[in-house]
Each structure stands twice: as C-alpha cells, then as structure tokens.
Amino acid sequence: LEVQVPEDPVVALVGTDATLCCSFSPEPGFSLAQLNLIWQLTDTKQLVHSFAEGQDQGSAYANRTALFPDLLAQGNASLRLQRVRVADEGSFTCFVSIRDFGSAAVSLQVAAPYSKPSMTLEPNKDLRPGDTVTITCSSYRGYPEAEVFWQDGQGVPLTGNVTTSQMANEQGLFDVHSVLRVVLGANGTYSCLVRNPVLQQDAHGSVTITGQPMTFP
C-alpha cells in the first residue's frame, strides 16, 4: 500500500493549527471498517491519533489532534494538529493498514517571528565623536534560533566587537540579545537585523546618533 506525504517539512507558526498531510489510494469497494490508521511520533513511537474498526479512536496527544472523517473514505488520512507548540516539532509517521500496509513520515517545522528589536545605548548621554558606546539589540519570543546582523548607515556590515547570546524561555521560544561595541563617528546610524531562517523574516531595529539628542526609529 503506497502512503504519500509531503517531502518538505510542514511549517507551522506557534499557536496556529497545522495539517500533516497523508494520503493513500483506496481500492474499489473499500470501506472504513477495513481501515486501520495510526499516527505516531517517529522517534519515540508515542501514539498521537488512531482510527480503527470504523471508529475514530481519538487523540492520544494532549487532545489537540483530529482527523478529517469526511475525507477518510477518499484516502485522506491527514492529521490536524491544533495550537502548535515548540515541543510539537519533529517527525510524525502515518501508518495505514487495509489489507496491505504502508507508512510514511512527515516533518513538522515550528516557527515564530521575532519581535521588533528594542535598542539601548550605554552610555546614553554626553556622547562625543571618539567615544566608545555599547549598543544592545534585543528581540524576543522567536523560533528557531536567530541570526543577527549589524550594519552602519551606509549598509556596511559590522562584524567586529559583536557579542550575541540566545536563551530559550519556558515555552522554548528564543530571546536574543546582541551587543555591538563601536567608536562613534561625528554622527551615524547603527542597525540591527534579527533573521528567522525558517520564515525568512527579518526584524529591524536602529539607533541614530547625531550629537544630541539620540533618536530610536
């Protein structure tokens, strides 16, 4: 029995619902009474959801999963996962048994956009050209790990004297803090870009130093 799933990972935003597609080709005369369907976590073999003896056996996975009962007879064994969490990320295997047996695994990639970076400056007053300042760019609750890029007002990358740290919070979302130490010119703009590699989404923050006062766009 050929069981088909998408080759590419299914990308789902934290808090949204995701559909893990799985399909099979029912033979003529097929009835749901013949169908045994099991969804499980590929790595741990933990049961997620099942269908047997013509009945939806329900969710074994925090009551956040559902099948598409009206579409099962047409060979659609897809699983709906509600309110996606970071912990859901991974591989799910769809097992289908009628007379024959087949299985295939689909990957769930979880993502969450990073917040618009907040920018802080230290010291933040009485600044003169030639002073060394520390600019901190902080962005929160993104997933997965971010990449952080700094550039000056002319778009030239700033790679020296950058220290970035990342920490997972209780939900598994990442808070990112990146610190740039820079010697001030007469005036200048310093931009921080926090990139989510899965969503291909960039969050921007910048600070412009023009003598006095400083501005935080």
């Epitope: 990639q109 790990e145 990449e147 890029f149 990342q166 598994g172 590699p197």
Partner: antibody, heavy 122, light 108 residues
C-alpha cells in the same frame, strides 16, 4: 552517507597559526549550524566555536579562544573552517567538527568528524 | 555561563547491571540537554536530546529523564559495548554551549 572530514591538524610552535578544515557531504550543508569542539589529552569535551547557517553567518566563541580563533564557512564548497592564531600550549587537543541534529537549530550534534590533532609545542 | 556537574566521576559495574548517571545544571535549562557516549580514540556519539528523546539508532536500553536542573541517563542493562565515557551538554543558554566533565563507566 552523511559525513564530516577534518583536516589541517599539525605540530605548531607557540604563537603560530593553523587553519583547520571540515569537509561536509551527504546533507544540505547550508541549512545546518556547525560547531568546533576540542578534547585535550585525557580531558573532557570543550566547545570551541559555532557558526550559523548563512554565508558569513554569526560566529560564536568560547572565552578561551575569543580574539584568537575565527570560524567561517563556505556553503558553496560545503566546508567549515577554523583559523587559529596566537596558538598556546593549552590549545593542544583533538579538534572535532560537528553538525547539529536538525536544520536551522543550534542544540545537539548528531554527526561528528573523526577529529584532527593539533599539537602546540616548541 | 551554565555549569554542568556530572556524578559520579567513575562508575564500576558488571555487564547486565543498571547504570545511573547524573548531570546537574547550575541553573534551570528546561529540557535542553543532550547526552553523548565516547569511546577511546573515537568521536562522541549522540545518545539523547531534549533530555529524554533517543537519537536515531540508539538502543532502547538507553533512557534519559529530568528537567530544570537535575538530569539522569539510565542504561537498563549494561552491554560490553556500553563501557565508555558519557557527557551531558546543555543548549538552553549560549554561548557557550557547555559540557559536563564526564562519567566513566568501567567494567567492575
């Protein structure tokens, strides 16, 4: 087959430089964070450096090597590098490159090279 | 920097016995912990990630548990090939990624 192969280890004098390479094959290199981890003779594992996925991506270093070592990657050549300058006797170790278990993540390493030996001695 | 402390330093056991290895973090790291096995002259091998998930191809006799600051790697029945050094590693808060000092499991 997923594989990492380090090269470039050698005997070098204190203050000298060395460049290690790690050639990757069998997977989509540009989707994975990569690491260098070292092990001094008879000692445990020490994380040295890591780099994010982009060409010219973010580099991270242990305090013990910051300012002396530079990690880089060439995604077109599927190769990870570690440029080691101002080498000290305490840098003597087997250096391993490692790949993260999952794309886009920096967590645990499920693919390791065989290691290359760096000896710093006069 | 998060410090990981492994205990005991050495565990002397016979084949067939149960091995219990401990890893303690200096602050909470959720379940962001991995376990590795290393044999002499070889690269480390990932056993467990996420504190309790077995990596691909790892036998069921290896299991991980714990969260927060206290973690355990259990080998239910030691086989001859399990005598090695075991390291824990955290990835909750970095840089740096940090490893524990290791536990050597040796034949009694």
């Amino acid at each position: 087959e997923v594989q990492l192969l380090e090269s470039g280890g050698d005997l070098v004098q204190p203050g000298g430089s060395l460049r290690l390479s790690c050639a990757a094959s069998g997977f989509n290199f540009s989707s994975y964070w990569m690491s260098w981890v070292r092990q001094a003779p008879g000692k445990g594992l020490e994380w040295v450096s890591g780099i994010s996925i982009s060409y010219g991506g973010n580099a991270y270093y242990a305090d013990s090597v910051k300012g002396r070592f530079t990690v880089s990657r060439d995604n077109s050549k599927n190769t990870l590098y570690l440029q080691m300058n101002s080498l000290r006797a305490e840098d003597t170790a087997v250096y391993y490159c490692g790949r993260d278990r999952s794309p886009y993540q920096y967590r645990s390493m499920d693919v390791w090279g065989q290691g290359t030996t760096v000896t710093v001695s006069s | 920097e998060i410090v990981l402390t492994q205990s005991p330093g050495t565990l002397s056991l016979s084949p067939g016995e149960r091995a219990t290895l401990s890893c303690r973090a200096s602050q909470s790291i959720r379940s962001d912990l991995a376990w590795y096995q290393q044999k002499p002259g070889q690269a480390p091998r990932l056993l467990i990630y996420g504190a309790s998930s077995r990596a691909t191809g790892i036998p069921a006799r290896f299991s991980g548990s714990g969260s927060g600051t206290e973690f355990t790697l259990t080998i239910s029945s030691l086989q001859s090939e399990d005598f090695a050094v075991y390291y824990c590693q955290q990835y909750n808060n970095w840089p740096p990624l940090t490893f524990g000092g290791g536990t050597k499991v040796e034949i009694k």
